[in-house]
Interface confidence: low
């Protein structure tokens, strides 16, 4: 069952995912001036079985000016390093997730991909968070956020995280910012969600919203 | 990558109703982009009317029409809305459809910047009589 939203927001933090439930897609994303080959996959499919894990689909990105050929070209060091500015500043200490039964690892990088990556998570993904540089972490409870199911809605937990500048004095102890439990943010909690208008939360999710992302493809 | 046509522009009196979508096309999954609308009167900068996360989950309104305009999006339809109520003349503008690549690692949850969007429709037409 696909997540109906996305994890929450936290305030100069990021978040990853040590390893991807089965399930779970990535689009297939090519860099500018290039593009999916035409019979490329929309799409890899972390699929698997009691002991085996592995991504279906391969993603192939051709030049955009080229129409029949799959011209692979070796990305540049600036390039490689401008994929790592959307990684975590520093190694994730948390389990290995990428050992458990039903989860796929980071699936290594394509030819030519975006410097982003798009995935579409299932139930029971967790992912964990981490204040990006020059933000330091205050804790009030787990740092992480997992996909659950209520009452047939799914819902991702909220983090207990907040990342305060090096220079900033906190207000922590005393701070008014109310806190939704660690087991996720009521409706109304839209304080860690960051936008220069309020948030207002949807409660009604497209019945087709199971189904839409495999029927959404055009030529 | 994603294209955008906005539709249902046109003339409303002041206090009345309008409805306009914006349909996506692309060889994508409409559900990796965040959907918002901007309008831009003669003039003037486009501005943030609202956007919505690319499941509907969260929205967010400029103060100008916040209680008067909602904007959905219906993913199997590859398509946003927006829903005019109690219009004003100040209303009057091309109001503009535009996306953004969800990121899963930066990003933010629903973008208000114009400059956040990577693809835009042509626009459509609303004009707000008194």
């Known amino acids: 069952e696909l997540c109906d939203d996305d994890p929450p927001e936290i305030p100069h933090a990021t978040f990853k995912a040590m390893a991807y439930k089965e399930g779970t897609m990535l689009n297939c994303e090519c860099k500018r001036g290039f593009r999916r080959i035409k019979s490329g996959s929309l799409y890899m499919l972390c699929t698997g079985n009691s002991s085996h894990s592995s991504w279906d689909n391969q993603c192939q990105c051709t030049s955009s000016a080229t129409r029949n050929t799959t011209k692979q070209v070796t990305p540049q060091p600036e390039e490689q390093k401008e994929r790592k500015t959307t990684e975590m500043q520093s190694p994730m200490q948390p389990v290995d997730q990428a050992s458990l039964p039903g989860h796929c690892r980071e699936p290594p990088p394509w030819e030519n991909e975006a410097t982003e990556r798009i995935y579409h998570f299932v139930v029971g993904q967790m992912v964990y968070y981490q204040c990006v540089q020059g933000y330091r972490a205050l804790h009030r409870g787990p740092a992480e956020s997992v996909c659950k199911m209520t009452h047939g809605k799914t819902r991702w937990t909220q983090p207990q995280l907040i990342c305060t500048g090096e220079m900033e004095t906190s207000q922590f102890p005393g701070e008014e910012k109310p806190q939704a439990s660690p087991e996720g943010r009521p409706e109304s909690e839209t304080s860690c969600l960051v936008t220069t208008t309020d948030f207002q939360i949807q409660t009604e999710m497209a019945a087709t919203m199971e189904t839409s992302i495999f029927t959404t493809e055009y030529q | 990558e994603v294209q955008l046509v906005e539709s249902g522009g046109g003339l409303v009196q002041a206090g009345g109703s309008l409805r306009l979508s914006c349909a996506a096309s692309?060889?994508?999954?409409?559900?990796?982009?965040?959907m918002a609308w901007f309008r831009q009167a003669p003039g003037k900068e486009r501005d943030f009317v609202g956007s919505?996360?690319?499941?509907?989950?969260?929205?967010s309104y400029a103060d100008s029409v916040k209680d008067r305009f909602t904007i959905s999006r219906d993913n199997a339809k590859s398509t946003v809305y927006l829903q005019m109520n109690n219009t004003k003349p100040e209303d009057t503008a091309v109001y503009y459809c535009a996306a953004y690549t969800y990121s899963g690692s930066f990003y933010s949850t629903v973008k208000t910047h114009r400059d956040e969007y990577q693809y835009w429709g042509q626009g459509t037409q609303v004009t707000v009589s008194s």
């Open positions: 919505i996360s690319r499941y509907g989950t969260y929205t």
């Open positions: 692309g060889r994508t999954l409409y559900s990796s982009y965040g």
